[in-house]
């Protein structure tokens, strides 16, 4: 399987909410012994290997934000902790998973990574990630709502498998 990032850049004004999205592509094993660990984290734009560094989002680590379930089941993060930080990650039946960030500020700008790990018999088998940039803008020239820029088809499918 692969992860697609429908949008490579999200440009939002301060105070707005945004939902960053990744999509699981390709055949997904739905066996009983297969589960998917999905999560989000921030990373550095300066890294040679995109998404290799895992930093918290609003002080919540990738462990705090993870979803753990089978195949294309729906799931949400544990509400209170994430919501206290204005965050919610979710996953639907179609392989889409997302993180919603509320009341954005300039300090939320940066590179965000989604990570999917396929786990078989309690062992990590396959991991893929996707990256996207969030740019929160201030001042009179900032957009009134979030504007999204599609990934090139090459980018959106070219996700590194480890």
């Amino acid at each position: 399987f692969k992860v697609a990032t429908p949008y490579s850049l999200y440009v939002c004004p301060e105070g707005q909410n945004v939902t960053l999205t990744c999509r699981l592509l390709g055949p997904v094993d739905k066996g009983h012994d297969v589960t998917f660990y999905k999560t989000w984290y921030r990373s550095s734009r300066g890294e040679v290997q995109t998404c290799s560094e895992r930093r918290p989002i609003r002080n919540l680590t990738f462990q705090d934000l993870h979803l753990h379930h089978g195949g294309h089941q729906a799931a949400n993060t544990s509400h209170d902790l994430a919501q206290r930080h204005g965050l919610e990650s979710a996953s639907d039946h179609h392989g889409n998973f997302s993180i919603t960030m509320r009341n954005l500020t300039l300090l939320d700008s940066g590179l965000y990574c989604c990570l999917v790990v396929e786990i078989r018999h309690h062992h990590s088998e396959h991991r893929v990630h996707g990256a996207m940039e969030l740019q929160v803008q201030t001042g009179k020239d900032a957009p009134s709502n979030c504007v999204v820029y599609p990934s090139s088809s090459q980018d959106s499918e070219n996700i590194t498998a480890a």
Epitope: S43, N59, Q135
Partner: antibody
Framework: QVQLVQSGAEVKKPGASVKVSCKAS????????LHWVRQAPGQGLEWMGY????????DYNQKFKDRVTMTRDTSTSTVYMELSSLRSEDTAVYYC?????????????WGQGTLVTVSS | DIVMTQTPLSLSVTPGQPASISCRAS??????????MQWYLQKPGQPPQLLIY???NVESGVPDRFSGSGSGTDFTLKISRVEAEDVGVYYC?????????FGQGTKLEIK
Amino acid sequence: QVQLVQSGAEVKKPGASVKVSCKASGYTFTSYWLHWVRQAPGQGLEWMGYIIPNTLHTDYNQKFKDRVTMTRDTSTSTVYMELSSLRSEDTAVYYCARLDGDYDYALDYWGQGTLVTVSS
Amino acid sequence: DIVMTQTPLSLSVTPGQPASISCRASESVEYYGTSFMQWYLQKPGQPPQLLIYTASNVESGVPDRFSGSGSGTDFTLKISRVEAEDVGVYYCQQSRKVPYTFGQGTKLEIK
């Protein structure tokens, strides 16, 4: 290594404009926001504004908003700060500085500074 | 705008002795547990150089005699043993909100 190299000193008359350049090297130019900070002789540091090179977005300190314009040229990895309607109190050293906007939001690399003297 | 107030404005220290500079913000510079407060040193005739970021993290290449502490509105820069090369003006700066603002500066000289 990361370097920000600024243009040379300028002497301008009141009412004129000045355009200072800042050439970046040693990193991916479009990945980091560039800020401008000025320092009048013997005074402290004053933030002027920033430009985001990949989207061209700018935001300026209200104090300068009608007089300052920040632009960029990605082909040469250079940002520019133009200040118009100069007055004597604009005499200062002007610095460009890179913002580490990944997590820390600190100005981690600075240009050497450009002295702008406004005098009749 | 967030107003940054530094104390003292000047400091004269004997080499080998400690030094401490305080900075108070007019409102909290914290965002989800991280304080967006920096410290810079400007040596004579040079641009400022980053010493400490997010209140307590020492920038790479900065001697470990420098340390930062504090959260919310009150911050401190400490030099455990002042050396001759530490002379210059120290500035605190917040990046919690634009416009970014700096303290007035603290001039450190050697006795």
